[in-house]
Each structure stands twice: as structure tokens, then as C-alpha cells.
């Protein structure tokens, strides 16, 4: 299709080479197309003006994204050619930063229902650059935490070094929806609830004497509880002896509950004590079996191919640790009488 009629928007993504971050493009169809298309505002036939330029499908997923190759080749369907770019309804998610994401992205409805719809498209010209060293050293992170029940704020990473007074007007989105009240480089939250978690996007306009563009940053916000003040609990094994059959395989599970920590480095391991000797066992990787806002339960198993007489003399010790302290639970194997 002819993209010369598409409305055009220039965006700049300056990414930090020090951290992982994501980026999004919204299918910003011009009004009134956008309101009718992306937000399912179903109009009755009487309300539809004759000249409405676009009467697209109300299904949010009925948007097609393309990339325009710089060499003039035909448009490419994003879903077929770019595995690191994911389409979610009217939004395009870039999972990894890099200058190779620079280019022209076009979105339009899949269903063309009237002659007017042909021009119903947006061309977004995305420029991706590494962050300039002129930016301040302590710019806000693209991953920010809000402490539940307390006051907090979400900062726009590309503007976090500027004072509120000199900051340009900022447009904020949360999970793709416009936050029309917020206009500064920081969103202040009086009391943090779990619904404040989500993907926030901040946009502001930058220009030179010639043209202007939108500088965009994406912030992943999570709501968290305060760091635990407790060392981890071992939930299993509870007993310090375990009846086993000689010659049979055996799996002993160690399950531990770790309280939430912002910087979370849990340790869970098995070691064996035999007389005066003690050694760590290389066992399968630990896995998280339950994760909540407040804590995480992690499991790690020790596997014996077959229980031997020697194993009955040993103690199998599960050791768990967080930044507060450590806990151990030992298990002695006992032959089943039978």
C-alpha cells in the first residue's frame, strides 16, 4: 500500500549501555480514527459522521505493523522478520535495545472498510542511539520499585537529571493508556498500592531550529514490600530422620521460604557430613516453586541413585541463606524395617 499519506512521527530512544531496557511504539492513529479503533468506542450508526476518515474494526489486535527497509525494498511484516519485537494489541514491544532497531515502522488497520481507510496509517521513524555521556551519571533506572503503603515516585529516565522547573512538559502512559493529569518529569504517588505496578512510558518533545521529535523512555515499575528482616525458613524436610530402603533410588527435597529482598541473592545447597568430613553436593539447580509479593519458596533436591549402607552413616544437610543469615536442617537416613 502507498505510505505517502501516513501521518509521520519521529521518536528517539536513547538507551543505556549499562542496563537492560525495553521500548514501545503505540499505533497512534490520528483522531478520530484512534479513538474509534484502538479503544473500542462503539458508535451507533446515527453518531457516525459522513466524513469520518477511518471506520476500522473494533478488535484491538486488528492492527498490522510493518518495517520499511532503508534500501527501498517492500514493507516487511514485523511478526515474520523480527523475533525481538513483539506485537501486543496496538503496541509494538522492543525487547532488546540497539541501534539496529532504528528505522521506519508503519501501523495500519488490517481491515480496510472504506476508501478513506487507505490513508489510515502512522509512520513512526525511530532513531536509536546510545546514551550520551553528557547525560548525568545518576539518571533514573528503567526498572523502578515502589514500596507498598508508602509514598513514592516514578521518574522519567531521560529527564531525571533536570529540575522540575526546567523540565519540559511530559506525557505519561501506563500500560498503554494516557495518564492525562501527569505532566511533569516525575509522578508522585501518595500511597502505593499493587495497582501502581506496570509499564510506564514518558514522552517529551525535543527540537532544534529545524525539526522536532519525541524522546521516549519506558519504565518497568513494580510494587514491593519492605526488605525482610528474617533469615529464611526451611519448610521441608521437617523431620531429622528419614526411613529409606537400601538399594533403592532416593530424592530428598529441601524447600525454603525467603522473605522479599530488593537485591535478592538466595542460597540453597546440600552438603554431606561423614565423620569429620564435609562436602557440598552438586545437585540439580534450585527452582522457584511459588513467588508472592512478600516471599518466594525455592526448592532444591538431592538425588541418590541407590541408597547404600554408607549413606546411613552420613548426615545430609540443607543450607539456606539470605542477606540476614542462614538456616540448616540435617537429615539422617534410617533403614526401613519391614
Amino acid at each position: 500500500f502507498n505510505i505517502s499519506g501516513c501521518s509521520t512521527k519521529k521518536l528517539l530512544w536513547t538507551y543505556s549501555t549499562r542496563s537492560e531496557e525495553e521500548f514501545v511504539l503505540f499505533c497512534d492513529l490520528p483522531e478520530p480514527q484512534k479513538s474509534h479503533f484502538c479503544h473500542r468506542n462503539r458508535l451507533s450508526p446515527k453518531q457516525v459522521p459522513e466524513h469520518l476518515p477511518f471506520m476500522g474494526s473494533n478488535d484491538l489486535s486488528d492492527v498490522q505493523w510493518y518495517q520499511q527497509p532503508s534500501n527501498g525494498d517492500p514493507l516487511e511484516d514485523i511478526r515474520k522478520s523480527y523475533p525481538h519485537i513483539i506485537q501486543d494489541k496496538c503496541t509494538l514491544h522492543f525487547l532488546t535495545p540497539g541501534v539496529n532497531n532504528s528505522g521506519s515502522y508503519i501501523c495500519r488497520p488490517k481491515m480496510i472498510k472504506s476508501p478513506y481507510d487507505v490513508a489510515c496509517c502512522v509512520k513512526m521513524i525511530l532513531e536509536v542511539k546510545p546514551q550520551t555521556n553528557a547525560s548525568c551519571e545518576y539518571s533514573a533506572s528503567h526498572k523502578q520499585d515502589l514500596l507498598l503503603g508508602s509514598t513514592g515516585s516514578i521518574s522519567c529516565p531521560s529527564l531525571s537529571c533536570q529540575s522540575d522547573a526546567q523540565s519540559p512538559a511530559v506525557t505519561w502512559y501506563k500500560n498503554g493508556k494516557l495518564l492525562s493529569v501527569e505532566r511533569s518529569n516525575r509522578i508522585v504517588v501518595d500511597e502505593v498500592y499493587d495497582y501502581h505496578q506496570g509499564t510506564y512510558v514518558c514522552d517529551y518533545t525535543q527540537s532544534d531550529t529545524v525539526s522536532s521529535w519525541t524522546v521516549r523512555a519506558v519504565v518497568q515499575v513494580r510494587t514491593i514490600v519492605g526488605d525482610t528482616k528474617l533469615k529464611p525458613d526451611i519448610l521441608d524436610p521437617v523431620e531429622d530422620t528419614l526411613e529409606v530402603e537400601l538399594g533403592k533410588p532416593l530424592t530428598i527435597s529441601c524447600k525454603a521460604r525467603f522473605g522479599f529482598e530488593r537485591v535478592f541473592n538466595p542460597v540453597i545447597k546440600w552438603y554431606i557430613k561423614d565423620s569429620d568430613l564435609e562436602w557440598e553436593v552438586s545437585v540439580p539447580e534450585a527452582k522457584s516453586i511459588k513467588s508472592t509479593l512478600k516471599d518466594e519458596i525455592i526448592e532444591r533436591n538431592i538425588i541418590l541413585e541407590k541408597v547404600t549402607q554408607r549413606d546411613l552413616r552420613r548426615k545430609f544437610v540443607c543450607f539456606v541463606q539470605n542477606s540476614i543469615g542462614n538456616t540448616t536442617q540435617s537429615v539422617q537416613l534410617k533403614e526401613k524395617r519391614g
Epitope: 532513531e127 546510545p130 546514551q131 550520551t132 532544534d208 529545524v210 521529535w213
Partner: antibody, heavy 120, light 110 residues
Framework: SLEESGGDLVKPGASLTLTCKAS?????????MCWVRQAPGKGLEWIAC????????TYYANWAKGRFTISETSSTTVTLQMTNLTAADTATYFC??????????????WGPGTLVTVSS | AAVLTQTPSPVSAAVGGTVTISCQAS????????LAWYQQKPGQPPKLLIY???SLASGVPSRFKGSGSGTQFTLTISEVQCEDAATYYC??????????FGGGTEVVVK
Amino acid sequence: SLEESGGDLVKPGASLTLTCKASGLDFSSVYDMCWVRQAPGKGLEWIACIYSDGSGSTYYANWAKGRFTISETSSTTVTLQMTNLTAADTATYFCARVLNGWGEYYFNLWGPGTLVTVSS
Amino acid sequence: AAVLTQTPSPVSAAVGGTVTISCQASQSVYNNNNLAWYQQKPGQPPKLLIYTASSLASGVPSRFKGSGSGTQFTLTISEVQCEDAATYYCQGYYSGYINAFGGGTEVVVK
């Protein structure tokens, strides 16, 4: 604004460093900083540019490679080191900012220039 | 090497007339449209008039018009004013981070 300094009268074979100071500008990695010169009564001649993304990446006109070195000494200062100067290097040297993004490339801001004269 | 050839020079025009300056590139500019036009008056640095072949820089009167693609470009000044007397340069940007300026065209207004 951009302001050049360091222009001088030097003898052939000498070296000279020019400095470009930026002030009151929006810093963005879409801009590169460049040097362009103009011999008296002649046209504009591009010398070199440096990315302003902190990477230190540079690009030069073929004739300038080796004798001219562009570098960023701070986030607001760019220098041009010139060695083994000859009379042909006599010119006004302009510092210019170029927008390099969205498939566009143009010099959108220029300094007033600084005069370098090479004569014995 | 990338070479930009400007013709003619000098060119004279009467006030209210039209001036056309041509810029021929020895190879296609980047994206076929990365050509800019600058105006320079004596003792001053150049001033951007046109970028990406045909886009008018802000603050530049609409009587300046750029056109062309690939290797052949034109700057047209219609309804020439006295203040348009200056030297005009084209500048091309090429793949591989190469810049080149044309030799310049002096416009004399009578």
C-alpha cells in the same frame, strides 16, 4: 551557541589545537560535532566529525586523515588538533553541529569561525 | 571521492525574478535525499536553508525551494530580494560517513 578559539598565525610545519565550546544547548546523542574550514575567498570544506554519544567515534574526510584529530575533551568541548601545517591550511575554521538521525543529516548550528594563518 | 558540482557561478538576478542553482553529485547521496542547501554572506557562517533535498528549515522564507533526488538537485529562489545576495552551497551526505560541499554559487542581485 558554539564558539571557536585557538586560531593563530603559525609557521609551516607547526601544530595547532582549535577548541569549540558549546553553551546553552540541548545535549542529545542525535547530534554530532564537526569541523569545517573555508580558505579565504574559497568554498566550504568538511574536515571531521565526532559522535556526541560518548563513544568517541569519529569520521574524517580522506584528505584530513593522519594530520587532523578531532576529540571530545568534555561533554561541551570538542577540539581539532592539526599537525604539520602548510600554507594551504590557511582558512577560517568553523565548528558546526550536525543532526544525524532519522535518515537525515544536516549542519544546523555554526560557530562564527576562528582564523588560522600559516605563513613563514 | 564524492564530488558535488554546482552551476552556474556567479548568477545574477533582478529583484522579483527567479534564480535556479543546480547541484550534481558524482554518486547518489544517502537515502537519495540527504542533500542540504546553505546560504553564506561575507564574514558570517553558513545558514541552513533546505535539508533532505526539499524540506524548508524553520524561519526560511517559502520563496526558497529545494528539489531533486539521487544525484541531481536544484535550489530555486523565486521573487528574489536584495537580501538574497549571497553565496549558496549544497552539501551531500553519503553512506560510509562521507560529507561533501559543492564549490558554491554566488548570487548577485541587480
